[in-house]
Amino acid sequence: EKPVYELQVQKSVTVQEGLCVLVPCSFSYPWRSWYSSPPLYVYWFRDGEIPYYAEVVATNNPDRRVKPETQGRFRLLGDVQKKNCSLSIGDARMEDTGSYFFRVERGRDVKYSYQQNKLNLEVTALIEKPDIHFLEPLESGRPTRLSCSLPGSCEAGPPLTFSWTGNALSPLDPETTRSSELTLTPRPEDHGTNLTCQMKRQGAQVTTERTVQLNVSYAPQTITIFRNGIALEILQNTSYLPVLEGQALRLLCDAPSNPPAHLSWFQGSPALNATPISNTGILELRRVRSAEEGGFTCRAQHPLGFLQIFLNLSVYSLPQLLGPSCSWEAEGLHCRCSFRARPAPSLCWRLEEKPLEGNSSQGSFKVNSSSAGPWANSSLILHGGLSSDLKVSCKAWNIYGSQSGSVLLLQGRSNLGTGVVPAAL
């Protein structure tokens, strides 16, 4: 009866350069328990080589010379006594491409090369990229361990060298970036930057790399309020904004953070559980009223913390003037001027373009001022008769603008013409 030698191994296997592959294999050979028990030796050879002379690519026979180019990279895995001939190939090289055959030997009775079941190995260019592993999300200020590994690679062959590059790594010393692992303490400015792990096998031309974009979670560090695209100045978490009464106001609150913070506006200085007047970063007031003078708060709420800024809104108005109006009274010529402005304006009277300051020492004129509600009133009393035609002006001004009015007093006329002349500062 013919001796039975059988081998189960896949016909072909493909592996990328620099990576590893395990080729499962099992075999059978004729063996009788009453035979003597010489050791069982198995071998993997390059196809086309004669077992008696060739160096093996892998064997369990300590007396057989192994090809230097496969030493340590081609290994028998599993128990040959259990007829396991599985072959592990590590750090695959292009020159490993080819066919291999398996051989079994046990004493003088069992010697056989399984030439009918050859293994075809094809080594292709490396396209596999390393994986960069870390616990997400990355949190600003919290040290995180990152590791770089190549799927399908193993310990066989020369060691792998690593290099890490990226803006987030600038403070690290070069030695740290040559390990497969590194500890990174990300900063907010590292969010969205690239981190690259490059792997190279020592002495080989095989290089592969993976780049990841860092997703750094960070609480808002600053809040900026924009009006018409221009950032307002902020001092000690407070911003001051003067607004013209009646004007429309649109403010945008921005607090860079990741993930984006929830922005909301509140009236005044709110308690933590206050109800916002806007649930977005935009505050819109169609017509600013003086009643809205005071404050608004923009709050940026984030899982990692919150930040808020107080906006001190001061409502201003240009001076509005009524008058002057003049009439003859017992004391003399009595002129009145009414005005309204925020902040409260200053006022002066002019006679023939000459300012009338305070009260005259000679008693030729007298100025009185009073206020009621948003309006302020000033009166001018001129003693004595008019020697000629006279022009009386009153002018009100604040830091935002001025307005003046004048009246021309004609000698011998009882009806006095008036006109209001607004004047900008």
């Epitope: 001796p3 196809d47 086309g48 080589e49 004669i50 077992p51 008696y52 002379y53 060739a54 160096e55 057989r64 010379r65 055959f101 010697k111 056989y112 090369s113 030439q115």
Partner: antibody, heavy 119, light 112 residues
Framework: QVQLQQSGGGLVKPGTSVKLSCKAS????????IHWVKQRSGQGLEWIGW????????KYNEKFKDKATLTADKSSSTVYMELSRLTSEDSAVYFC????????????WGQGTSVTVSS | DVLMTQTPLSLPVSLGDQASISCRSS???????????LEWYLQKPGQSPKLLIY???NRFSGVPDRFSGSGSGTDFTLKISRVEAEDLGVYYC?????????FGGGTKLEIK
């Protein structure tokens, strides 16, 4: 028991060819390298070449490359050597020898077959 | 080709004597796999050669222990400690490390 049984040869005319055979038994045919060795009358031994059925590997001594052609028939476990364009120089006893194992030695020999080239 | 030179060409001995045959190769016969394939064969008249020693010093199965081989590099020796009548014949050294494989010219061991 390993045995190599040789046949063929005899008296042949110059310019013709002869095919010698070496039939193996007692082992797995693909596991032995079969060598052919020439010995002229009263002379030493000369290695002609080998045939390894395991991978159909053939190696020749350059001196015999144009003289000898080695082939095999696995089904009959036989290795052949054909000698062409025979001359009197080819008159000799030809041995086949089996070589198995890592010891590199020709451990089993056929009985030899004689070729006489004469008109 | 590797030239194998045997000395002496003829070695007359008395039965029971020690015999020594030398073989020198024209270059190292260490194979690329690390083995030295130096063998000794004995051919008796009208017979096929028989293997005695392989890989310089290993006796083939069934070969009496009075036969021993030694040497390295390019110089090798076959010794027969006590010659017996059945040992007579022509001894050939052989190298199987480099193609073409080559035999020595032979040493004829004969009775004095």
């Amino acid at each position: 028991q390993v045995q190599l049984q040789q046949s063929g040869g005899g008296l042949v005319k110059p310019g013709t060819s002869v095919k010698l055979s070496c039939k193996a038994s007692g082992y797995i045919f693909t596991e032995y390298i079969i060598h052919w060795v020439k010995q002229r009358s009263g002379q030493g031994l000369e290695w002609i070449g080998w045939f390894y059925p395991g991978i159909i590997s053939i190696k020749y001594n350059e001196k015999f490359k144009d003289k000898a052609t080695l082939t095999a028939d696995k089904s009959s476990s036989t290795v052949y050597m054909e000698l062409s364009r025979l001359t009197s120089e080819d008159s000799a006893v030809y041995f086949c020898a089996g070589h198995e194992g890592y010891d590199g030695a020709m451990d089993y020999w056929g009985q030899g077959t004689s070729v006489t080239v004469s008109s | 080709d590797v030239l194998m030179t045997q000395t002496p060409l003829s070695l007359p001995v008395s039965l029971g004597d020690q015999a020594s045959i030398s073989c020198r190769s024209s270059q190292s016969i260490v194979h690329s796999n690390g083995n030295t394939y130096l063998e000794w064969y004995l051919q008796k008249p009208g017979q096929s050669p028989k293997l005695l020693i392989y890989k310089v010093s290993n006796r083939f199965s069934g070969v009496p222990d009075r036969f021993s081989g030694s040497g390295s590099g390019t110089d090798f020796t076959l010794k027969i400690s006590r010659v017996e009548a059945e040992d007579l014949g022509v001894y050939y050294c052989f190298q199987g490390s480099h193609v073409p494989w080559t035999f020595g010219g032979g040493t004829k061991l004969e009775i004095k």
